[in-house]
């Protein structure tokens, strides 16, 4: 994938992080237009859908990571999720099917800006890695624990257990950008120093 | 196949713990599901008691929320209901039965409860 | 909690005769999204565990005859027996599946003539 320019300011850049990750905690931008589209909007559904939300590494997992590593499990996460997003825009309606049952196409349309957002995220990890490495202070790399593993759906018995696997999955990938969140709010203010 | 088998105690006294076993063959709980206990009264009533999660988490009636608890061993693949404080008014068929999310796809054959001294 | 009301309570019958029921939910069982109405049908014999008929209002469980159809959207719900057979003789239950706690109608009793 093609790599846009990075901004060589560590603040600049780590704003930009937060501001990314802040909007992809965002359920209203991916997770209950996914909701509404496949149907699954009724309480019942709801509530098995916030069930295990797969094998995402857990906050306190990322805590534990030095930044670069940190930077490096995100990366990989963020990878396996992209799959899985493809997969998911795959088995939605298509816009005309859409229109004909009366559904609000702007959900589909939320649902397909998902992955250039994360492609974005992905470009400024990528620089704030690159920013790290050349900073003074050097820093262990600790491999995240289920960094890359991609959250894996129990075998799905028809389309509608697929649609309820995607749910939980998304369900768990907010959570997921929750706690990124946090972490990276525990940054410093310069690439040398981490506020604990 | 899948399969749903309810055991335990005919005949229960007042004021005691009802409790009440599922033994499920040909499919794991922890897979997928919820997994459910339901109770029919003398008159056909039916009523939804609560569930189990595949992943443990679980749901109850509120009419029965304060009696009520449902839990399981993995190992065995099975669950359990418990319910307190019986009264007579709990003398009912009871049933498990497996919800794949859009209905109750898989039922045990129920066994019959009495509440009585 | 959704209260399911059914109608009748009894039915008499003839064998090859076509029936309808009805059930009426207190709320919605309609999903906003999809449009996919949230509720079941089950048959119940004497003696014997409910067993699933419809779901989703409409779709058939596998291995159900087609003789049975379920209809209805929102909160008015039919099933209808195209040409009854001694073997449907049962109790039929409607059932809310759309918000817990899950509820049922009290049945319908479908009796020979």
């Known amino acids: 994938a093609a790599i846009g320019s990075c901004s060589k300011e560590y603040r600049v850049l780590l704003g930009q992080l937060q501001k990314q990750t802040d909007l992809m905690q965002d359920t209203s931008r991916l997770l209950d237009p996914y909701i509404r589209i496949q149907g699954l909007d009724v309480p019942k559904l709801r509530e098995h859908c916030r069930e295990r939300p797969g094998a995402f590494p857990s906050e306190e997992t990322l805590r534990g990571l030095g930044r670069r590593g940190f930077l490096q499990t995100l990366n990989a996460t963020l990878g396996c999720v992209l799959h899985r997003l493809a997969d998911l825009e795959q088995r939605l309606p298509k816009a005309q099917d859409l229109e004909r049952s009366g559904l609000n196409i702007e959900d589909l349309e939320k649902l397909q800006m998902a992955r250039p957002n994360i492609l974005g995220l992905r470009n400024n990890i990528y620089c704030m890695a690159q920013l790290l490495d050349n900073s003074d202070t050097a820093e262990p790399t600790k491999a995240g624990r289920g960094a890359s593993q991609p959250p894996t759906p129990t075998p799905a018995s028809d389309a509608f257990q697929r649609k309820l696997e995607g749910c939980r999955f998304l369900h768990g990938y907010h959570r997921f950008m929750h706690s990124v969140g946090r972490v990276f709010s525990k940054w410093g203010e310069s690439p040398n120093r981490s506020r604990r | 196949e899948v399969q749903l088998q309810e055991s335990g105690p005919g005949l229960v006294k007042p004021s005691q713990s009802l409790s009440l076993t599922c033994t499920v063959t040909g499919y794991s709980i922890t897979s997928d599901y919820a997994w459910n206990w339901i109770r029919q009264f003398p008159g056909n009533k039916l009523e939804w008691m609560g569930y189990i999660s595949y992943s443990g988490s679980t749901s109850y009636n509120p009419s029965l929320k304060s009696r009520i608890s449902i839990t399981r061993d993995t190992s065995k693949n099975q669950f359990f209901l418990q319910l307190n404080s019986v009264t007579t008014e709990d003398t009912a068929t009871y049933y498990c039965?497996?919800?794949?999310?859009?209905?109750?796809?898989?039922w045990g054959q129920g066994t019959s409860v009495t509440v009585s001294s | 909690d959704i209260v399911m009301t059914q109608t009748p309570s009894s039915l008499s019958v003839s064998a090859g005769e076509k029936v309808t029921m009805s059930c009426k939910s207190s709320q919605s069982l309609l999903s906003s999204g999809n449009q996919k109405n949230y509720l079941a049908w089950y048959q119940q014999k004497p003696g014997q565990p409910p067993k699933l008929l419809i779901f989703?209002?409409?779709t058939r469980e596998s291995g159900v005859p087609d003789r049975f159809t379920g209809s209805g959207s929102g909160t008015d719900f039919t099933l209808t027996i195209s040409s009854v057979q001694a073997e449907d003789l049962a109790v039929y239950y409607c059932q809310n599946d759309h918000s817990y706690p899950l509820t049922f109608g009290a049945g319908t009793k479908l009796e020979l003539k």
């Open positions: 039965a497996r919800d794949r999310y859009e209905a109750m796809d898989y």
């Open positions: 989703g209002a409409s």
